[in-house]
């Protein structure tokens, strides 16, 4: 069955090694021919013809593993419904990097969980992350093939210090926003409590200035400032944060009583109201939704409810009097 007249060269799709003329002639409603497995993969329940509705499972050769949905389903029109599935190497190959970079440890293959360190000649630093971990078949973070060495300024300054700090002898001091932030860094939306205004700032500048005056600058969200719920909540959480007993550093951000730092994303994520622990003396008297009755909630509950964008009016700090 062909949708085109067969009076020229048989079709070869970009992603198929089989020509139409090589496909076995079958009635569309009688089933499906054997599908083409991904590279380094094979069909587990292999046969010539599959019934409509039948699934085939894609398996991978030793040293590879399936990524994506590994089942294809035979459709009534004789084609296969297949998601993106590929066989990825379960080990990482030594990355190809510029000659100036040294890889430690140096080996051909690395097992999942193994890490490498990239180093540069004396007086230079890696212009990007220096430590990479093998996860599946790829390195995390991804290794750019344009990665190179640059004059040792920022990384040398930072040393083993926290974000926004640099090494000075044996101690950590704040980076200078003017001197240490000439390199590119991602945009952040930031709120300044002094000017009561929000603006877009490069991450390096924000971290350096926050280090110099911790109380004044507040991270709102990654990316440039744009009107919307994310900005609105960012400003509201900044107001609530002054009463938070918990202030946990988390990537660019600081997590408060009603939040948890996500280990995988290094972002503060709001808890849900039932996850709030009763403890704490930061109480508020509130009115929920269109209700007329007052309710005493702790700061965690207030934060989670506002984060979820549920209607709530804070009447006053402290317990409700009634």
């Amino acid at each position: 069955f062909s949708i085109m007249e067969n009076n020229g060269q048989p079709c070869i799709n970009d992603d198929e090694e089989m020509k139409e003329v090589d496909l076995p002639e079958i009635e569309a409603d009688s089933g499906c021919p054997q599908p083409v497995p991904p590279e380094n993969g094979f069909i587990r329940n292999e046969k010539q013809l599959y019934l409509v509705g039948e699934d085939v499972e894609i398996s991978c050769l030793t040293g590879f593993e399936t990524v994506g949905y590994q089942y294809f389903r035979c459709l009534p029109d004789g084609t296969w419904r297949q998601g993106d599935v590929e066989c990825q190497r379960t080990e990482c190959i030594k990355p190809v990097v510029q000659e100036v970079l040294t890889i430690t440890p140096f080996q051909r293959l690395y097992r999942i969980g193994e890490s490498i360190e990239l180093t540069c000649p004396k007086g230079f630093v890696v212009a990007g992350p220096s430590r990479y971990t093998c996860q599946g078949n790829s390195w995390t973070p991804p290794i750019s093939n344009s990665l190179t060495c640059e004059k040792d300024t920022l990384t040398k300054l930072k040393g083993h210090c926290q974000l926004g700090q640099k090494q000075s002898g044996s101690e950590c001091i704040c980076m200078s926003p003017e001197e240490d932030c000439s390199h590119h860094s991602e945009d952040l939306c930031v709120f300044d409590t002094d000017s009561n205004d929000y603006f877009t700032s490069p991450a390096c500048k924000f971290l350096a200035e926050k280090c110099l005056n911790n109380q004044q600058l507040h991270f709102l969200h990654i990316g440039s400032c744009q009107d919307g719920r994310q900005l609105e909540w960012g400003l509201e959480r900044t107001r609530l944060s002054s009463n938070s007993t918990k202030k946990e550093s988390c990537g660019y951000d600081t997590c408060y009583d009603w939040e948890k730092c996500s280990a995988s994303t290094s972002k503060c994520v709001c808890l849900l109201p039932p996850q709030c622990f009763k403890g704490g003396n930061q109480l508020y008297c509130v009115k929920m939704g269109s209700s007329t009755s007052e309710k005493t909630l702790n700061i965690c509950e207030v934060g989670t409810i506002r984060c979820a964008n549920r209607k709530m009016e804070i009447l006053h700090p402290g317990k409700c009097l009634a």
Epitope: G228, R229, W233, V269, C270, Q275, K278, K295, A308, N309
Partner: antibody, heavy 118, light 112 residues
Amino acid sequence: EVQLVESDGGLVQPGGSLRLSCVASGFTFSDYYMAWVRQAPGKGLEWVATINYDGSSTYYRESVKGRFTISRDNAKRTLYLQMDSLRAEDTAVYYCARPSTEALFAYWGQGTLVTVSS
Amino acid sequence: DIVLTQTPLTLSVTPGQSVSISCRSSQSLLNDVGNTYLYWYLQKPGQSPQLLIYLVSDLGSGVPNRFSGSGSGTDFTLKISRVEAEDVGVYYCMQASHAPYTFGAGTRLEIK
């Protein structure tokens, strides 16, 4: 160690009532919201109800509203689920669950089977 | 209510193999401040469910790092990188981004 132990369920006739209880230990019971989750035989999980620290706020799934009542006695460290006007579709293993900062249902009891049948 | 569709319904694997379980939501689980409340649980035979993954990709306390979660919006995946005999049971995804909280129908993992 957090422990949640549900009382024995049982066989009830349609339209009948039953009260489940769940005794907590290993943590300060009054500091946490608590919930009930159920699982019909051979089926998936279904959230039933949640209660706040002192019982002043309760939340229910639509299908049990007006028939089920979640309550707690902090002095006895016990969570309750009063089930009235029971229907065949309420037949399930009922679990009591406690949240943590990781998840709403981080700790689970062993479950108790409630069978509604004539 | 949000419907979570899990595929496949059953998985039969040999120890050491890697598997992925898909969970598709009838509506985006990403809320307007950028949070996604998607969890994965494992219910071993004759036991209560236990938390594996929270907030899409964070590993629950004491969960081996053979388990990993990924996804966004409406499509989520639980991956077990090297299946062990103790991983048998039913895997459930659960969402708490929209009330009421809902679970997927489950994916049964068995060892060949």
